[in-house]
């Protein structure tokens, strides 16, 4: 049979997910009932590798599958009839398949610092990059990450900086690529503690009696993590600034003149059976000398005569020596220290005076 | 194919309000970042608006801050600007896009704001 | 804001010829730079992304280079269809900031 040759395709459309591309085209041919169509599809750059797809008489569309996500690939159209009569030029159109969300990213705090770090394993196919947003309540940021390569399974990570601690954020990440954008993958991170802000004041210290005082002070800040404890340190020497080194003295070593500085009194913050929020300042009065134990920590009665000064320490964690049972590891705890207050005078036992002037 | 239908212009005095609507089609609407763009009469583009897809975040140029508003309606697949207090300066044809990587990929055919008293 | 200043403001070229648009940022925008044509009375078309990759259905015969703060857009043999304004845009940091445009006509 003799056959005129086909007339080129038009109006090719196109409709893509991330694996496969459904093409519709149109022939106007009287004739185009009898024609079939065969389909070059390529990807950009590898021209060596052409799927080629042959429909079947009449039939307008066809699927072409097992694309690669986020990748161009050009394909043309030839109408055929007969012994394989074609139309003179291909109908050409160029197309991109939808890029791969991020399958999941992990969270992970940095110790002490108030940052995230995003890790991921790149999502199959191509990519040109993806956006990043980090939300926490009004505040929100916006930015691009680099592309990457899922060839080899590398393990992807950034680092969110410029975050406050303590600080729950939700962060939602969007593989890009070719102009599209896949469906964000989000996640809820909440980022890590440091040492509380040292406060301003410095305990107020009132004598009570010739052996014990009370000391009053206003809880710690908690913009760098929820305060756990606070202890409370009484000195008889020069109140120098306080270091993580004197949470290990207690009132045992202050009697034995192992240390002019101990720790009194230990507070757990928790067993206050209320939450703390950041603006909430919670009013603390301790009696000092009433020989209660919290943990490690002898609260024992304090020198007639002797002058004390108190500060207070706040941990945001508190950690425990494994070996010395209810003592502070001061190195691995976050720790800070309020002033020293100024020294207080206790008076001399009236009664010891009263019994030693009789003698 | 990827299509984006601005519309809500018109002519408004000073210190009125206006709201611009930019229907998409073609796409999934809900994963994309979209802006507004505007093109004052014989002048050059600049960049409005900026909305997210993950939680709606939005950004703004400085000179409409606190005026404009952009917000998104995934469910009916449109993008909005509510205009208020119009200036002079705000008379321009204004564009939706979306904006992967900062890159303004695919416009409407603009809806033209006239700002006159 | 970073600045980005587009020259020239305008050329002419004839049919064939090649002709090149410099974008300089006022400061480093890594590769996240787009370039744009649009012709009168219509919307603008992006040409190039990310410095220089060619957006879907653009010919050949554009191309894009630079990185950091020097950018440019090549017009291998100038096409009438190809008259227009040309603009570049820096995506890096908000504000978004576009050049003033250049105005390519056909001699």
């Known amino acids: 049979a003799q056959y005129t040759r086909p007339s080129n395709v038009s109006n090719i459309d196109v409709s893509t997910n991330t694996t496969a591309a459904t093409l519709s085209w149109q022939n106007f041919d009287d004739a185009s009932p009898t024609y079939s169509y065969c389909l070059l599809i390529e990807k950009a750059g590898n021209s060596s590798n052409a799927t080629q797809v042959v429909t079947d008489i009449g039939i307008t569309d066809a699927t072409v599958t097992e694309l690669i996500p986020g990748s161009s690939y050009t394909v043309e159209i030839f109408a055929q009839v007969g012994d394989g009569i074609k139309s003179l030029e291909p109908g050409r159109k160029s197309f991109c398949t939808d890029p791969a969300s991020m399958a999941s990213f992990d969270c992970e705090v940095v110790p002490k610092e108030p940052a995230l770090v995003l890790k991921w394993t790149c999502p199959p196919g191509a990519n040109a990059g993806f956006e990043l947003e980090v939300s926490s309540g009004a505040w929100n940021n916006a930015t691009h990450l680099e592309s990457c390569s899922s060839e080899n399974g590398t393990e992807y990570r950034t680092e969110v900086t410029y975050l406050n601690f303590s600080t729950s954020y939700n962060i939602s990440i969007t593989t890009v690529s070719c102009g599209k954008m896949a469906a964000p993958t989000r996640n809820t991170c909440t980022t890590g503690i440091t040492d509380p802000p040292p406060p301003d004041g410095s305990p107020n210290i009132t004598s009570v009696s010739h052996n014990s005082v009370k000391v009053k002070f206003s809880g710690f800040e908690a913009s760098h993590g929820p305060i756990k404890a606070y202890a409370v340190i009484l000195t008889t020497g020069e109140a120098g600034h306080p270091s993580a080194d004197v949470l290990k003295y207690t009132y045992e070593d202050f009697k034995k003149g192992a240390s002019d500085t101990y720790v009194t009194y230990l507070i757990r913050t928790e067993e206050k059976g209320r939450s703390q929020s950041l603006s909430e300042v919670l009013k603390y009065e301790i009696d000092v000398g009433n020989e209660s134990t919290t943990l490690g920590y002898y609260n024992g009665k304090l020198e007639p005569l002797g002058s004390y000064r108190a500060c207070v320490a706040g941990f945001t964690n508190i950690t425990f020596h494994p070996q010395n049972k209810g003592l502070i590891d001061g190195a691995e705890s976050y720790v800070s220290f309020s002033r020293y207050s100024d020294a207080v005078s206790l008076p001399q036992d009236v009664a010891a005076a009263h019994h030693h002037h009789h003698h | 194919e990827v299509k984006l239908v601005e519309s809500g212009g018109g002519l408004v005095q000073p210190g009125r309000s206006l709201k611009l609507s930019c229907a998409a089609s073609?796409?999934?609407?809900?994963?994309?970042?979209m802006a507004w763009v505007r093109q004052a009469p014989t002048k050059g583009l600049e960049w409005v608006a900026y909305i997210t897809n993950g939680f709606g975040s939005t950004y703004y140029r400085d000179s409409v801050k606190g005026r404009f508003t952009i917000s998104r309606d995934n469910a009916k697949s449109t993008l909005y600007l509510q205009m208020d207090s119009l200036r002079s300066e705000d008379a321009a044809t204004y564009y939706c896009?979306?904006?992967?990587?900062?890159?303004?990929?695919?416009w409407g055919q603009g809806t033209l704001v006239t700002v006159s008293s | 804001d970073i600045q980005m200043t587009q020259t020239p403001h305008s050329l002419s070229a004839s049919l064939g010829e090649t002709v090149s648009i410099e974008c300089l940022a006022s400061?480093?925008?890594?590769?996240?730079l787009a370039w744009y044509q649009q012709k009168p009375g219509k919307s603008p078309q992006l040409l190039i992304s990310h410095a220089n990759p060619l957006h879907d259905g653009v010919p050949s015969r554009f191309s894009g280079s630079g990185s950091g703060t020097q950018f440019s857009l090549k017009i291998r043999n100038m096409q009438p269809e190809d008259e227009g304004v040309y603009y570049c845009q820096q995506g890096y940091k908000f504000p978004y900031t576009f050049g003033a445009g250049t105005k390519l006509e056909l001699k």
């Open positions: 896009s979306t904006v992967p990587l900062g890159a303004f990929v695919s």
């Open positions: 400061e480093g925008i890594s590769n996240y």
């Open positions: 073609g796409f999934t609407f809900s994963n994309y970042y």
